[in-house]
């Protein structure tokens, strides 16, 4: 069997969700030594990086201006050391937003309930669209997908106060073109007196691990690349 | 204080529509959820529907689908629900209801339905 | 859509005495249940929200509890201004759906 490196980590930098016109930056985060990275764009090649020096950098960044429809899909890289190359990475869904119009979204029974209430979202949109996203704030990767011709809803609950946060909602043109986002709804639960303080789920800081972690190579950097590689794949 | 204020009654012809009016004061209209309720003549209560006047988001009960249709004047903090094709099983008590939890009741509009 | 079972459909009492009415969910509707009085001329008024939250100028001989799907609804000491009708009405799920209604009449 031919011999390859381990795949490298793909993210992109402060969100994968990327409003028209504004440029997307995307990680490729591999092995020091790398002499070259390709990102691939829905299976072909998009873009070639060759870090300078290779030995020193354990990653590069894809650049993306003006971002539209057209380069908004899939994106996975792969790097090579010498003559070998990696496996490739996973997928990295890359979204265009601002497209269109703007919905609205609001909540049922209100935005201040008590835990154990169940809660529904309801995000309209009238212009033409089929599929509608809700994500809350600080926790984008985890977006909910409903279908409507002009509404959908979200039922959620019976909530905790695992549920509090700002919510938003958007309208899809198809799976990576997104409408502008609606304003939040606060999402405010009280009561469950036991349970009040940071639950498990709740992020303490917005989409904390949407960041590259490229590094330049020092002595110590050496001994942990290793270290820094695994971290990255349990983090993921 | 809240207050939603509804026609006492209406006297339709069958097959003819009517639009009930319900008026809003004392909180801010466009924050809450508004349900439409019917109660017909020593029955029990039936939910219609509910709109949000902020953002135009309407949930129907799928048995009144075809029968009603919520919309809301911002300007005047008025909820209307049009009842289309009348009948007598129409005859009814319509109750406006403020706020996603049923808070505050309208005083009902009673439709009569009689040629 | 949830069924909701009222009983009993119909209680006579009297004056002082404690009387409980219950609402069984068909289905899962967490705590968002409330109770409703309805007068003789039609007005109605909530008195319980959130299955045990009391509405504001409700006397406190209402209460409101659950115990898995079975929810109820106690009037500690009836006075006379309680002999009317209740409803249950979940609001969890759309449609929502009212019980069929308890008629409290003085004994």
């Known amino acids: 069997p031919k011999q390859t490196l381990p795949k490298p980590i793909i993210r992109a930098e402060s969100t994968y969700m990327v409003p028209k016109e504004k440029q997307a930056t995307l990680c490729c985060q591999g092995s020091y030594g790398a002499v070259e990275y390709q990102l691939h764009f829905e299976g072909s090649l998009f873009a070639v990086e060759r870090p300078k020096p290779p030995e020193r950098i354990n990653g590069v960044k894809f650049h993306i201006p003006d971002m539209n429809s057209r380069k908004a899909g899939r994106y996975s890289c792969i790097y090579r050391v010498g003559e070998l190359w990696s496996e490739r990475s996973d997928l990295l869904d890359l979204v265009v937003t601002e497209m269109y119009d703007t919905p609205t979204l609001s909540v049922h029974p209100g935005p201040e309930v008590t835990s154990g209430e169940k809660v529904t979202f309801y995000c309209r949109l009238d212009t033409a669209t089929s599929m509608f996203l809700l994500l809350k704030e600080g926790r984008s990767r985890d977006v909910q997908r409903s279908y409507g011709k002009v509404q959908a809803e979200f039922p959620m609950g019976p909530v905790t106060t695992a549920h509090r946060g700002s919510y938003r909602c958007f309208g899809s043109y198809n799976n990576y073109a997104w409408s502008f986002p609606s304003e939040p709804v606060k999402l405010l639960v009280t009561g469950d007196i036991e349970n009040t303080s940071l639950a498990p789920t709740d992020p303490t800081f917005p989409d904390s691990w949407d960041t590259c972690l490229l590094t330049r190579e020092t002595g110590l950097q050496k001994d942990l690349a290793l270290w820094d590689h695994t971290a990255q794949n349990l983090l993921r | 204080q809240v207050q939603l204020q509804q026609p006492g009654a209406e006297l339709v012809k069958p097959g003819a529509s009517v639009k009930l009016s319900c008026k809003a004061s004392g909180y801010t209209f466009t924050s809450y959820w508004m349900h439409w309720v019917k109660q017909r003549p020593g029955q029990g209560l039936e939910w219609i529907g509910m709109?949000?006047?902020?953002?135009?988001?309407?949930n129907y009960n799928e048995k009144f689908k075809s029968k009603a249709t919520l919309t809301v004047d911002k300007s005047s903090s008025t909820a209307y629900m049009q009842l289309s094709s009348l009948t007598s099983e129409d005859s009814a008590v319509y109750y406006c209801?403020?706020?996603?939890?049923?808070?505050?009741w309208g005083q009902g509009t009673l439709v009569t339905v009689s040629a | 859509d949830i069924q909701m079972t009222q009983s009993p459909s119909s209680l006579s009492a009297s004056l002082g005495e404690r009387v409980s009415l219950t609402c069984r969910a068909s289905?899962?509707?967490?705590?968002?249940l409330n109770w409703l009085q309805q007068e003789p001329d039609g007005t109605i008024k909530r008195l319980i929200y959130a299955t045990s939250s009391l509405d504001s100028g409700v006397p406190k001989r209402f209460s409101g509890s659950r115990s898995g799907s079975d929810y109820s609804l106690t009037i500690s000491s009836l006075e006379s201004e309680d002999f009317v009708d209740y409803y249950c009405?979940?609001?969890?799920?759309?449609?929502?759906?009212f019980g069929s209604g308890t008629k409290l009449e003085i004994k």
């Open positions: 009405l979940q609001y969890a799920s759309s449609p929502f759906t």
């Open positions: 289905q899962d509707i967490g705590s968002s």
């Open positions: 709109i949000h006047p902020n953002s135009g988001s309407t």
């Open positions: 209801v403020y706020d996603g939890r049923f808070a505050y």
